[in-house]
């Protein structure tokens, strides 16, 4: 799978994680920090 950094317009898309652009899938993906989940890493879990 080809990946690259998200475009600058997606700054802030991932609330608690790193934004990755999955080129072949035509979508952005949030790689969440430890303790966070959700499509945009918006949920905290213990």
């Amino acid at each position: 799978v080809s990946i690259t950094k998200c475009n600058s317009d997606m700054n802030g898309y991932c609330l608690h994680g790193q934004c990755i652009y999955l080129v072949d899938m035509s979508q952005n993906y949030c790689r969440c920090e430890v303790g966070y989940t959700g499509v945009r890493c918006e949920h905290f879990y213990l």
Epitope: T4, D9, M10, G12, L15, S26, N28
Partner: antibody
């Protein structure tokens, strides 16, 4: 199946406002950004602005600042675009477009006609 | 706002011809460019995103290339069904469409 269903055609007088809705089904708008694009008859595509429904943040094209308001109601999974002080040049098809989790998934378009 | 200068605004070519459309950005857009096809009365159809990634179901005669500020869209062998208007879109910083290229058959 993911869908963006827009409200029906509108006819407005110059100086009036119009509010176009864009209801999402099959996905949560909080996971996406919703863009708005318009196309006047026989003209090209023009980006107007976008909203991040999760945070409520908006970005607008400079030429529309102060005249366009994009909002989202996450409880109904619906985005809105309101354009005020309408003039004849605002006659166009207005599209909502999902981006973020999927690159550019378009609504069917809403024709807004501005005529006295 | 980033400006996108698309050329030519229209072109006429024969079936089987190679067709090339260019878009020049006013600043580096880091390969974040997409190409759309629009036929009369229809919503735009995404053909290519991230400069060269073809969308599923899009014929391989369509391709894209470029980097920095200069980008190219190519139809390697023009077919009658390719008659449409084509638009580039930069999506690096906000969004800007090119002015469009109307492709006709000679």
């Amino acid at each position: 199946q993911d869908q963006l269903v827009q409200s029906g055609a509108e006819v407005k007088k110059p100086g009036a406002s119009v509010k176009v809705s864009c209801k999402a089904s099959g996905f949560n708008i909080k996971d996406t950004y919703i863009q708005w694009v318009r196309q006047a008859p026989g003209q090209g595509l023009e980006w107007m602005g976008r909203i991040d429904p999760l945070r409520g943040n908006t970005k607008y094209r400079e030429k529309f600042e102060g005249r366009v308001t994009i909002t989202a109601d996450t409880s109904t999974n619906t985005a809105y675009m309101e354009l005020s002080s309408l003039r004849s040049e605002d006659t166009a098809v207005y599209y909502c477009v999902r981006s973020g989790t999927l690159f550019d998934f378009w609504g069917q378009g809403t024709l807004v006609t501005v005529s006295s | 706002d980033i400006q996108m200068t698309q050329s030519p605004s229209s072109l006429s070519a024969s079936v089987g011809d190679r067709v090339t459309i260019t878009c020049k950005a006013s600043q580096d857009i880091h390969k974040y460019i997409a190409w759309y096809q629009q036929k009369p009365g229809q919503a735009p159809r995404l053909l290519i995103q991230y400069t060269s990634t073809l969308q599923p179901g899009v014929p391989s005669r369509f391709s894209g290339s470029g980097s920095g500020t200069d980008y190219t869209f190519t139809i390697s062998s023009l077919q009658p069904e390719d008659i449409a208007t084509y638009y580039c879109l930069q999506y690096d910083n906000r969004r800007t469409f090119g002015g469009g290229t109307k492709v006709e058959i000679k």
